[in-house]
Interface confidence: low
Protein backbone atom coordinates (compact mmCIF):
# COMPACT_ATOMS: atom_id res chain seq x y z
CA UNK A 1 0.00 0.00 0.00
CA UNK A 2 1.36 3.40 -0.98
CA UNK A 3 1.07 5.74 1.99
CA UNK A 4 3.58 8.40 1.02
CA UNK A 5 2.98 11.89 -0.31
CA UNK A 6 5.22 14.18 -2.34
CA UNK A 7 5.52 17.82 -1.40
CA UNK A 8 6.88 20.06 -4.15
CA UNK A 9 7.75 23.70 -4.64
CA UNK A 10 4.48 23.94 -6.56
CA UNK A 11 3.89 26.63 -9.16
CA UNK A 12 6.97 28.81 -9.35
CA UNK A 13 8.27 31.61 -11.53
CA UNK A 14 11.74 32.90 -12.26
CA UNK A 15 13.43 35.50 -14.39
CA UNK A 16 14.90 34.82 -17.80
CA UNK A 17 18.65 34.29 -17.46
CA UNK A 18 18.33 33.39 -13.80
CA UNK A 19 18.29 30.06 -12.00
CA UNK A 20 15.74 28.08 -10.02
CA UNK A 21 15.80 25.12 -7.66
CA UNK A 22 13.26 22.36 -8.24
CA UNK A 23 12.55 20.49 -5.02
CA UNK A 24 10.41 17.51 -4.09
CA UNK A 25 10.17 15.81 -0.74
CA UNK A 26 8.71 12.36 -0.11
CA UNK A 27 7.13 11.92 3.30
CA UNK A 28 4.76 9.66 5.26
CA UNK A 29 6.43 6.46 4.11
CA UNK A 30 9.30 4.29 5.28
CA UNK A 31 9.95 3.05 1.74
CA UNK A 32 13.53 3.15 0.50
CA UNK A 33 14.18 5.59 -2.35
CA UNK A 34 16.16 3.75 -5.01
CA UNK A 35 16.12 6.37 -7.74
CA UNK A 36 14.77 9.84 -8.48
CA UNK A 37 14.12 10.96 -12.06
CA UNK A 38 13.67 14.60 -13.02
CA UNK A 39 11.71 15.09 -16.22
CA UNK A 40 10.40 17.98 -18.31
CA UNK A 41 7.42 17.06 -20.48
CA UNK A 42 8.82 14.14 -22.50
CA UNK A 43 12.50 14.70 -21.79
CA UNK A 44 14.64 13.32 -19.03
CA UNK A 45 16.78 15.96 -17.30
CA UNK A 46 18.60 13.94 -14.67
CA UNK A 47 18.68 10.81 -12.56
CA UNK A 48 19.85 10.41 -9.00
CA UNK A 49 20.40 6.70 -8.37
CA UNK A 50 21.04 5.47 -4.83
CA UNK A 51 23.92 3.27 -5.99
CA UNK A 52 25.24 5.07 -9.07
CA UNK A 53 24.77 8.68 -8.00
CA UNK A 54 23.80 11.53 -10.31
CA UNK A 55 23.67 11.44 -14.08
CA UNK A 56 22.69 14.55 -16.03
CA UNK A 57 21.26 14.12 -19.52
CA UNK A 58 23.87 15.23 -22.06
CA UNK A 59 21.39 17.66 -23.60
CA UNK A 60 21.15 19.57 -20.32
CA UNK A 61 24.57 19.18 -18.73
CA UNK A 62 25.50 22.81 -19.38
CA UNK A 63 22.39 24.21 -17.67
CA UNK A 64 21.44 21.65 -15.03
CA UNK A 65 23.22 21.03 -11.75
CA UNK A 66 22.46 18.28 -9.24
CA UNK A 67 21.11 19.22 -5.85
CA UNK A 68 20.63 20.49 -3.33
CA UNK A 69 19.78 17.07 -1.95
CA UNK A 70 17.57 15.21 -4.40
CA UNK A 71 16.52 18.51 -5.99
CA UNK A 72 17.68 19.98 -9.26
CA UNK A 73 19.03 23.42 -10.14
CA UNK A 74 18.19 24.91 -13.53
CA UNK A 75 20.48 27.69 -14.72
CA UNK A 76 20.50 30.24 -17.57
CA UNK A 77 16.74 30.04 -17.83
CA UNK A 78 14.98 30.86 -21.08
CA UNK A 79 11.28 31.32 -21.82
CA UNK A 80 11.37 27.90 -23.46
CA UNK A 81 11.97 26.40 -20.02
CA UNK A 82 8.40 27.31 -19.07
CA UNK A 83 6.33 24.19 -18.48
CA UNK A 84 5.75 21.15 -16.33
CA UNK A 85 8.51 19.38 -14.46
CA UNK A 86 8.14 16.04 -12.71
CA UNK A 87 10.07 14.37 -9.95
CA UNK A 88 9.60 10.61 -10.05
CA UNK A 89 10.58 8.75 -6.90
CA UNK A 90 11.20 5.05 -7.41
CA UNK A 91 10.83 3.37 -4.04
CA UNK A 92 10.90 -0.09 -2.55
CA UNK A 93 8.53 -1.62 -1.71
CA UNK A 94 5.92 1.11 -2.39
CA UNK A 95 6.54 1.72 -6.09
CA UNK A 96 6.57 5.03 -7.96
CA UNK A 97 5.56 8.44 -6.61
CA UNK A 98 5.32 11.45 -8.92
CA UNK A 99 5.37 15.14 -8.06
CA UNK A 100 4.58 18.00 -10.42
CA UNK A 101 6.05 21.50 -10.59
CA UNK A 102 5.00 24.20 -13.03
CA UNK A 103 7.72 26.70 -13.87
CA UNK A 104 7.03 30.00 -15.60
CA UNK A 105 10.04 31.91 -16.88
CA UNK A 106 9.30 35.62 -17.06
CA UNK A 107 10.82 38.32 -19.24
CA UNK A 108 10.15 40.93 -16.57
CA UNK A 109 11.79 41.32 -13.19
CA UNK A 110 8.61 40.30 -11.38
CA UNK A 111 8.97 36.65 -10.33
CA UNK A 112 7.17 35.35 -7.31
CA UNK A 113 7.18 31.91 -5.78
CA UNK A 114 3.89 30.07 -5.62
CA UNK A 115 2.60 28.26 -2.57
CA UNK A 116 3.76 24.79 -1.69
CA UNK A 117 1.25 22.07 -2.30
CA UNK A 118 0.96 18.34 -1.83
CA UNK A 119 0.17 15.57 -4.28
CA UNK A 120 -1.34 12.49 -2.59
Amino acid sequence: MMTGTIETTGNISAEKGGSIILQCHLSSTTAQVTQVNWEQQDQLLAICNADLGWHISPSFKDRVAPGPGLGLTLQSLTVNDTGEYFCIYHTYPDGTYTGRIFLEVLESSVAEHGARFQIP
Partner: nanobody
Amino acid sequence: QVQLAESGGGSVQTGGSLRLSCAASGNTGSRRYVAWFRQAPGKEREGVARLITDSGSTYYADSVKGRFIISQDNAKNTVYLQMNTLKPEDTAMYYCAEELAPARSGGIWFGGRYFSYWGQGTQVTVSS
Protein backbone atom coordinates in the same frame (compact mmCIF):
# COMPACT_ATOMS: atom_id res chain seq x y z
CA GLN B 1 12.21 -11.55 -12.68
CA VAL B 2 11.62 -10.67 -16.32
CA GLN B 3 13.06 -12.54 -19.29
CA LEU B 4 13.40 -10.85 -22.68
CA ALA B 5 14.01 -12.56 -26.01
CA GLU B 6 14.67 -10.71 -29.25
CA SER B 7 14.13 -12.04 -32.77
CA GLY B 8 13.75 -10.78 -36.32
CA GLY B 9 17.27 -9.66 -37.08
CA GLY B 10 19.04 -10.47 -40.33
CA SER B 11 20.72 -9.05 -43.40
CA VAL B 12 19.07 -6.55 -45.71
CA GLN B 13 20.02 -4.13 -48.48
CA THR B 14 20.04 -0.37 -48.04
CA GLY B 15 16.47 0.93 -48.11
CA GLY B 16 15.04 -2.37 -46.90
CA SER B 17 12.94 -3.13 -43.83
CA LEU B 18 13.04 -5.46 -40.84
CA ARG B 19 10.76 -6.00 -37.86
CA LEU B 20 12.36 -6.94 -34.56
CA SER B 21 10.37 -8.58 -31.77
CA CYS B 22 10.99 -8.52 -28.04
CA ALA B 23 8.98 -11.14 -26.17
CA ALA B 24 8.75 -10.75 -22.40
CA SER B 25 7.99 -13.47 -19.89
CA GLY B 26 8.01 -13.72 -16.14
CA ASN B 27 6.78 -11.08 -13.73
CA THR B 28 5.57 -8.47 -16.23
CA GLY B 29 3.07 -5.80 -15.24
CA SER B 30 0.66 -3.62 -17.20
CA ARG B 31 3.05 -0.64 -16.94
CA ARG B 32 6.33 -1.53 -18.53
CA TYR B 33 9.11 0.71 -19.75
CA VAL B 34 10.66 -1.08 -22.73
CA ALA B 35 13.44 0.26 -24.95
CA TRP B 36 15.47 -0.84 -27.93
CA PHE B 37 19.21 -0.22 -27.86
CA ARG B 38 21.86 -0.96 -30.43
CA GLN B 39 25.60 -1.37 -30.37
CA ALA B 40 27.83 -1.36 -33.42
CA PRO B 41 31.37 -2.81 -33.26
CA GLY B 42 33.74 -0.39 -31.58
CA LYS B 43 30.95 2.03 -30.65
CA GLU B 44 29.04 2.77 -27.48
CA ARG B 45 25.60 1.34 -26.96
CA GLU B 46 22.89 3.85 -27.89
CA GLY B 47 19.18 4.10 -27.29
CA VAL B 48 16.96 3.84 -30.35
CA ALA B 49 13.36 3.92 -29.13
CA ARG B 50 11.30 3.39 -26.02
CA LEU B 51 7.71 2.63 -25.15
CA ILE B 52 5.67 2.94 -21.96
CA THR B 53 3.19 0.11 -22.34
CA ASP B 54 0.19 1.39 -20.39
CA SER B 55 0.05 4.84 -21.99
CA GLY B 56 1.55 3.96 -25.36
CA SER B 57 3.94 6.89 -24.99
CA THR B 58 6.91 6.61 -27.36
CA TYR B 59 10.28 8.29 -27.75
CA TYR B 60 12.83 8.03 -30.56
CA ALA B 61 16.46 8.92 -31.04
CA ASP B 62 16.99 11.62 -33.65
CA SER B 63 18.92 9.19 -35.86
CA VAL B 64 15.87 6.97 -36.40
CA LYS B 65 12.94 9.39 -36.22
CA GLY B 66 10.57 8.90 -39.13
CA ARG B 67 12.14 5.55 -40.06
CA PHE B 68 11.65 3.33 -37.00
CA ILE B 69 8.37 2.60 -35.19
CA ILE B 70 8.07 1.00 -31.77
CA SER B 71 4.78 -0.75 -31.00
CA GLN B 72 3.30 -3.44 -28.81
CA ASP B 73 0.98 -6.43 -28.68
CA ASN B 74 -0.27 -6.61 -25.11
CA ALA B 75 -1.86 -10.01 -25.58
CA LYS B 76 1.52 -11.47 -26.51
CA ASN B 77 3.59 -9.36 -24.09
CA THR B 78 5.66 -8.40 -27.10
CA VAL B 79 7.21 -5.10 -28.20
CA TYR B 80 8.19 -4.58 -31.83
CA LEU B 81 10.65 -2.34 -33.63
CA GLN B 82 9.66 -1.78 -37.26
CA MET B 83 12.76 -0.53 -39.08
CA ASN B 84 12.22 1.06 -42.49
CA THR B 85 14.54 2.75 -44.99
CA LEU B 86 17.50 1.03 -43.39
CA LYS B 87 20.99 2.46 -43.84
CA PRO B 88 24.44 0.86 -43.50
CA GLU B 89 24.94 2.90 -40.31
CA ASP B 90 22.01 1.01 -38.76
CA THR B 91 24.15 -2.13 -38.75
CA ALA B 92 24.51 -3.25 -35.13
CA MET B 93 23.47 -5.74 -32.52
CA TYR B 94 19.99 -4.72 -31.32
CA TYR B 95 18.91 -5.32 -27.73
CA CYS B 96 15.63 -4.82 -25.97
CA ALA B 97 15.66 -3.81 -22.34
CA GLU B 98 13.14 -3.18 -19.63
CA GLU B 99 13.31 -0.74 -16.75
CA LEU B 100 12.34 -2.21 -13.40
CA ALA B 101 10.63 0.92 -12.04
CA PRO B 102 9.34 2.76 -15.11
CA ALA B 103 9.30 6.54 -15.12
CA ARG B 104 6.37 8.63 -16.27
CA SER B 105 8.01 9.59 -19.54
CA GLY B 106 11.25 10.63 -21.13
CA GLY B 107 14.09 8.82 -22.83
CA ILE B 108 16.48 7.20 -20.41
CA TRP B 109 19.40 6.30 -22.62
CA PHE B 110 22.82 6.81 -20.96
CA GLY B 111 24.14 3.64 -22.53
CA GLY B 112 21.37 1.67 -20.88
CA ARG B 113 22.98 1.72 -17.45
CA TYR B 114 19.65 2.17 -15.66
CA PHE B 115 17.79 -0.67 -17.35
CA SER B 116 17.36 -3.77 -15.23
CA TYR B 117 16.54 -6.51 -17.72
CA TRP B 118 18.19 -7.25 -21.05
CA GLY B 119 17.74 -9.69 -23.89
CA GLN B 120 20.58 -11.49 -25.65
CA GLY B 121 20.35 -9.33 -28.76
CA THR B 122 19.69 -9.85 -32.46
CA GLN B 123 22.07 -8.87 -35.25
CA VAL B 124 21.01 -6.45 -37.99
CA THR B 125 23.29 -6.01 -41.02
CA VAL B 126 22.56 -3.47 -43.74
CA SER B 127 24.69 -3.64 -46.86
CA SER B 128 24.94 -1.04 -49.59
